[in-house]
């Protein structure tokens, strides 16, 4: 088992909104749960967009999930990852980081 590296990034979307993307990379096996949570509750599927789980050419896999949130509410959102029985949560970085 190779645990994923998880990285959360933010980018400007429409006025007052930002897109937050949670990327999981270099993991094996390919089965993974990756989802955005607001106040520890998973967002509905229709408010999230997932990337395909694809091989990265090094024998491991990668995927991502993105959602659009209101600027200023970042602290309410976390990316939840579960892989091979282990799980972790990852906050949205502050604007400067």
């Amino acid at each position: 088992t190779v645990p994923p590296m998880v990285n959360v990034t933010r980018s400007n979307a429409s006025e007052g909104n930002i897109t937050v993307t949670c990327r999981a990379s270099s993991f094996y096996p390919r089965n993974i749960i990756l989802t955005w949570r607001q106040d520890n509750v998973s967002l509905s599927n229709d408010t999230q967009q997932w990337g395909d789980v694809l091989p990265d050419g090094n024998g491991t896999y990668q995927t991502w999930v993105a959602t659009r949130i209101c600027r200023g509410e970042e602290q309410n959102f976390t990316c939840y990852m579960e892989h091979s029985g282990n799980h972790s949560t990852h906050p949205v970085p502050s604007n400067g980081s």
Epitope: D52, L54, G57
Partner: antibody, heavy 122, light 112 residues
């Protein structure tokens, strides 16, 4: 959408090697799978291999495993394919194409270069 | 390797006609991630191919809605509802689910 600028036509002798380049701009290079494809005149396309620019990991069509070697230079945002031990069978147009992994399209060849013509002749 | 067989080889059409191209794969082309990477490309003379359809039925950005893709399992179809002059060229189906990825032999759409 960005640009994928391929190097110019090559005339090479049998047995020699050639290194083709695909210089990119206008998108995040490391987020892309770059594929190389071969097309002989009047024929269909063949996929050679892909390389993921974020890690340099790759996947090859076994047919081209001993013929082609893919590399990337992230500092210059350029993908390369070296073709070795060239024969007349390697004469073709070679395309680079990309899949933007963090874009909305789940297509492997969403954007293409214009192709490089390689002619192998004594 | 997955063999992609396109029919017909040549498709003479009149402008405004509907055109239909078939693509049959030698085995099911569902990726291990459960997606079906069946794509359609159009190549005009002297140009690079251009993506039309991905994942069986999704139109790529900027592709007119007269193009549609359908199918499942091993049988896939590209339809052009009303052929325009700019649609002439060679159409290729492609599977990117199983390595090595493979293309069909092409269908040339030309004026009748």
């Amino acid at each position: 959408q960005g640009q994928m600028q391929q190097s110019g036509a090559e005339l090479v002798k049998p047995g020699a090697s050639v290194k083709l380049s695909c210089k990119t701009s206008g998108f995040t290079f490391s987020d892309n799978y770059i594929s190389w494809l071969k097309q002989k005149p009047g024929q269909s396309l063949e996929w050679i291999a892909w390389i993921y620019a974020g890690t340099g990991g790759s996947s090859y069509n076994q047919k081209f495993r001993d013929k082609a070697q893919l590399t990337v230079d992230t500092s210059s945002r350029t993908a390369y394919m070296q073709l070795s031990s060239l024969t007349t069978e390697d004469s073709a147009i070679y395309y680079c194409a990309r899949h933007d992994y963090y874009g909305t399209s789940g297509a492997w060849f969403a954007y293409w270069g214009r192709g490089t013509l390689v002619t192998v002749s004594a | 390797d997955v063999l992609m067989t396109q029919t017909p080889l040549s498709l003479p059409v009149s402008l405004g006609d509907q055109a239909s191209i078939s693509c049959r794969s030698s085995q099911h082309i569902v990726h291990s991630n459960e997606n079906t990477y069946l794509e359609w490309y159009l190549q005009k003379p002297g140009q690079s191919p251009k993506l039309l359809i991905y994942k069986v039925s999704n139109r790529f950005s900027g592709v007119p809605d007269r193009f549609s893709g359908s199918g499942s399992g091993t049988d896939f179809t590209l339809k052009i509802s009303r052929v325009e002059a700019e649609d002439l060229g060679v159409y290729y189906c492609f599977q990117g689910s199983h390595v090595p990825w493979t293309f069909g032999g092409g269908t040339k759409v030309e004026i009748k």
